[in-house]
């Protein structure tokens, strides 16, 4: 009679985490009499997975009814697979012996690899805002995937970025892995509406990559440009001076008018107009009663934007340039009259 062979037809199988793994094993003969055992690994450190004869193996079920007299199928199913279950599984035939059964023949082994999906990528930007032309770093992290092979790409508004560094940890063997990538992005004034996207592709995702995003609106600070202009005379002895605050982001802005270096009025930006690029404009104006001044007046519009050092723009108001109109019956007003923004 031909000697018994233990056949494990699958050299390797791959199973998604959470699913069941079926490990196939058949024997070619009913002789010698004795049980089958399944082990993970080989040698003295191997781990018993299933013993036909005895023991409690809650995650393991047999595919066939082993109590049937002529059964030669000793395949097993392991439920709820996790990455920790990866390894090489051996189906081993034992010969009945006294006092102990004796190992008779082993199958060639089936390598079980476990596929685990990466977590949704989390993108984080710098702690502090930065201004256009500056380079900022974004990080992307994803965890818990297996196998180790993974692809990560960075995009800004759909355009792929090339300046990034990626590490997959650990470098050695592990039940699951993590990826960490840092991308460098140069900010432009138009980036308020921009998005940075980290895209992760893995065998478990079946061609549908995971994405994590960061809005550059959380990262960018666009400083305002200031323009102070003198409007034509509105009424007798009064000049309208406006401070146009343009193209700034975020909204947080405080404006102070100074008259010859002395604080005249402070106001906080409200009723802003939004530009197409996401930046804001604002305007503040003053009515100046020139009749109250003997000398020229230096008017300064000082803006503190988003907690940054103040920027300012000045305008010299020439008193001589506004002669008093004859026959005026308007009583002289205060030197400076505040006005709501237009």
């Amino acid at each position: 009679e031909e000697e018994l062979q233990v056949i494990q037809p699958d050299k390797s199988i791959s199973v998604a985490a959470g699913e069941s793994a079926t490990l196939h094993c058949t024997v070619t003969s009913l002789i010698p009499v004795g049980p089958i055992q399944w082990f993970r690994g080989a040698g003295p450190g191997r781990e018993l997975i299933y013993n036909q004869k005895e023991g409690h193996f809650p995650r393991v079920t047999t595919v066939s009814d082993l109590t049937k007299r002529n059964n030669m199928d000793f395949s097993i199913r392991i439920s709820n697979i996790t990455p920790a279950d990866a390894g090489t599984y051996y189906c081993v035939k034992f010969r009945k012996g006294s006092p102990d059964d004796v190992e008779f023949k082993s199958g060639a082994g089936t390598e079980l690899s476990v596929r685990a999906k990466p977590s949704a990528p989390v993108v984080s930007g710098p702690a502090a805002r930065a201004t256009p032309q500056h380079t900022v770093s974004f990080t992307c992290e994803s965890h818990g995937f297996s196998p180790r092979d993974i692809t990560l790409k960075w995009f800004k508004n759909g355009n792929e970025l090339s300046d990034f560094q990626t590490n997959v940890d650990p470098a050695g063997d592990s039940v699951s892995y993590s990826i960490h990538s840092t991308a460098k992005v140069v900010l432009t004034r138009e980036d308020v509406h921009s998005q940075v996207i980290c895209e992760v592709a893995h065998v478990t995702l079946q061609g549908d990559p995971l994405r994590g995003t960061a809005n550059l609106s959380e990262t960018i600070r666009v400083p305002p440009t200031l323009e102070v202009t003198q409007q034509p005379v509105r009424a007798e002895n009064q000049v309208n001076v406006t401070c146009q605050v343009r193209k700034f982001y975020p909204q947080r802005l405080q404006l102070t008018w100074l008259e010859n270096g002395n604080v005249s009025r402070t106001e906080t930006a409200s009723t802003l107009t939004e530009n197409k690029d996401g930046t804001y404009n604002w305007m503040s104006w003053l009515l100046v009663n020139v009749s109250a001044h003997r000398d020229d007046v230096k008017l300064t519009c000082q803006v503190e934007h988003d907690g940054q050092p103040a920027v300012s723009k000045s305008h010299d108001l020439k008193v001589s340039a506004h002669p008093k109109e004859q026959g005026s019956n308007t009583a002289p007003g205060p030197a400076l009259a505040s006005a709501a923004p237009l």
Epitope: V92, E103, G107
Partner: antibody, heavy 122, light 112 residues
Framework: QVQLQESGPGLVKPSETLSLTCTVS????????WSWIRQPPGKGLEWIGF???????FYQSSLKSRVTISLDTSKNQFSLKMTSVTAADTAVYYC????????????????WGQGTTVTVSS | DIVMTQSPLSLPVTPGEPASISCRSS???????????LDWYLQRPGQSPQLLIY???SRASGVPDRFSGSGSGTDFTLKISRVEAEDVGVFYC?????????FGQGTKVEIK
């Protein structure tokens, strides 16, 4: 191709602890046993012990009380710690990979480090 | 522990001639599966040991076919069909059936 590299101090004082690390490059830790073997000057090979990739350890009975072998799969490294050393522990220490294909035994120590000389002296 | 005994302990050889080394184990290395857990190693001067034969008779990767292993149970032989100058060094047999792994005392092969 797999390479092993031992690292650690070449001189240890008597009664102190000998610590060696072996870094595995170019291959996986999984499915192998990772062994420490030593060779005293002018003598033969003495097996100290090994660790399986699943963390199970086996030691030479005469050294068991003094020896610990540990594995850091994340770094692809395994380590040997031997306490209370004496001059008799002076040797070339090799780290090595032992294959296991099936069954209860092993299939040869197929990859060896270049060895590191450890001298126990005050 | 399984005790491994080699003979001879020293073997002067002539290049081109055959050579053989014996190894005896204190208990059978033939496992119930029919596998023999006996290995042969060569340690060249100043180098680490290298695996020549495993499983009693299987040549390790890259080992020249002039090396062959035979034997079963407790008696084993390593044969070199034609010795070459690079074969000088110490040959060790080792058992891998059970822990502790044990080695023979070594056979020093040198050119006559």
């Amino acid at each position: 191709q797999v390479q092993l590299q031992e690292s650690g101090p070449g001189l240890v004082k008597p009664s102190e602890t000998l610590s060696l690390t072996c870094t595995v490059s170019g291959g996986s830790i999984r499915d192998y046993y990772w062994s420490w073997i030593r060779q005293p000057p002018g003598k033969g090979l003495e097996w100290i012990g090994f660790i399986y990739y699943n963390g199970r350890t086996f030691y030479q009975s005469s050294l068991k009380s003094r020896v610990t072998i540990s594995l850091d799969t994340s770094k692809n490294q395994f380590s040997l710690k031997m306490t209370s050393v004496t001059a008799a522990d002076t040797a070339v220490y090799y780290c090595a990979r032992v294959r296991a294909y099936s069954g209860i035994g092993l299939d040869g120590t197929d990859v060896w480090g270049q060895g590191t000389t450890v001298t126990v002296s005050s | 522990d399984i005790v491994m005994t080699q003979s001879p302990l020293s073997l002067p050889v002539t290049p081109g001639e055959p050579a053989s080394i014996s190894c005896r184990s204190s208990q059978s290395l033939l496992y119930s599966t029919g596998y023999t857990y006996l290995d042969w190693y060569l340690q060249r001067p100043g180098q680490s040991p290298q695996l020549l034969i495993y499983g009693g008779s299987s040549r390790a990767s890259g080992v020249p076919d002039r090396f062959s292993g035979s034997g079963s149970g407790t008696d084993f032989t390593l044969k070199i069909s034609r010795v070459e100058a690079e074969d000088v060094g110490v040959f060790y047999c080792g058992q891998a059936l059970q822990t502790p792994l044990t080695f023979g005392q070594g056979t020093k092969v040198e050119i006559k």
